[in-house]
Amino acid sequence: MMTGTIETTGNISAKKGGSVILQCHLSSTMAQVTQVNWEQHDHSLLAIRNAELGWHIYPAFKDRVAPGPGLGLTLQSLTMNDTGEYFCTYHTYPDGTYRGRIFLEVLESSVAEHSARFQIP
């Protein structure tokens, strides 16, 4: 039975040219996290963080994606095309797979405020 929940940074906004941290957190379960996959709105892979093998960064993003902090991702040099959904998929044992969603809006304006965190069951 899957008892865990994924908490994410929710809906966030950031300034064009700036950077943003995409972060998910798995709680309410003792399951072991074996891997976290980060994917974009079109289901293309941004990165993988395997507990033992470390990080895989999709080559198209190697100059703009920094691993971490933790199991999260830092997306740098933001463009307007980065606006959209991002998904964290937690592969766990023995629970199975948990998935969280973040919506990133990249703004032209100089002010970009982060919204409150929210939970996805």
């Epitope: 892979l45 395997n50 033992e52 198209a60």
Partner: antibody, heavy 119, light 107 residues
Framework: EVQLVQSGAEVKKPGSSVKVSCKAS????????IHWVRQAPGQGLEWMGG????????IYNQIFRGRVTITADKSTSTAYMELSSLRSEDTAVYYC????????????WGQGTTVTVSS | DIQMTQSPSSLSASVGDRVTITCRAS??????VVWYQQKPGKAPKLLIY???YRFTGVPSRFSGSGSGTDFTLTISSLQPEDFATYYC?????????FGGGTKVEIK
Amino acid sequence: EVQLVQSGAEVKKPGSSVKVSCKASGYTFTEHVIHWVRQAPGQGLEWMGGFNPNHDGTIYNQIFRGRVTITADKSTSTAYMELSSLRSEDTAVYYCARAAKLLFAMDYWGQGTTVTVSS
Amino acid sequence: DIQMTQSPSSLSASVGDRVTITCRASQHVSNAVVWYQQKPGKAPKLLIYSPSYRFTGVPSRFSGSGSGTDFTLTISSLQPEDFATYYCQQHYSTPWTFGGGTKVEIK
């Protein structure tokens, strides 16, 4: 030049163990994961597991059910793969391979070690 | 475990031919696919990763494409040194798994 040099061919009895070595050179050993892949005669490739020398992390293909152990000696830049409780189906060529940095692709491979299990 | 199914398992072609090999994953693997080339008695060599980036030194006649579950390796103009067996592999989730291989033979 990146090189992975493996130990020589082995002939083993069923039920015994074999330990294959893989000596790395031409790069910083702790910066790249080492994987082990095997290939039975006339068959395809099968991933056995990997070892991350950066933090001594190991991951195994559960199909081997605890029969495989991957270790390394960082002082000599050498990785090891030990397979126990050998059976005839374990007759294969065993390869070590290095993973590219920040990429789950095996970019350099050892020459292979033939392990024959026969009574 | 994710199954990777390659087709065809073998093909005969002539020098200069355009050759296409396909690989289908049993479930979504995004762009986490790699292609290797192996010649008899030799270790595999990395050709293409992620799944359209050529590894260092790989000729431009080799190209890869696909996403999700369906992937393709194309050799635009087959050369004598290209006769070999080609394998796809997924690293979307462990255990990493390979396709059964496609043997490219001389017609």
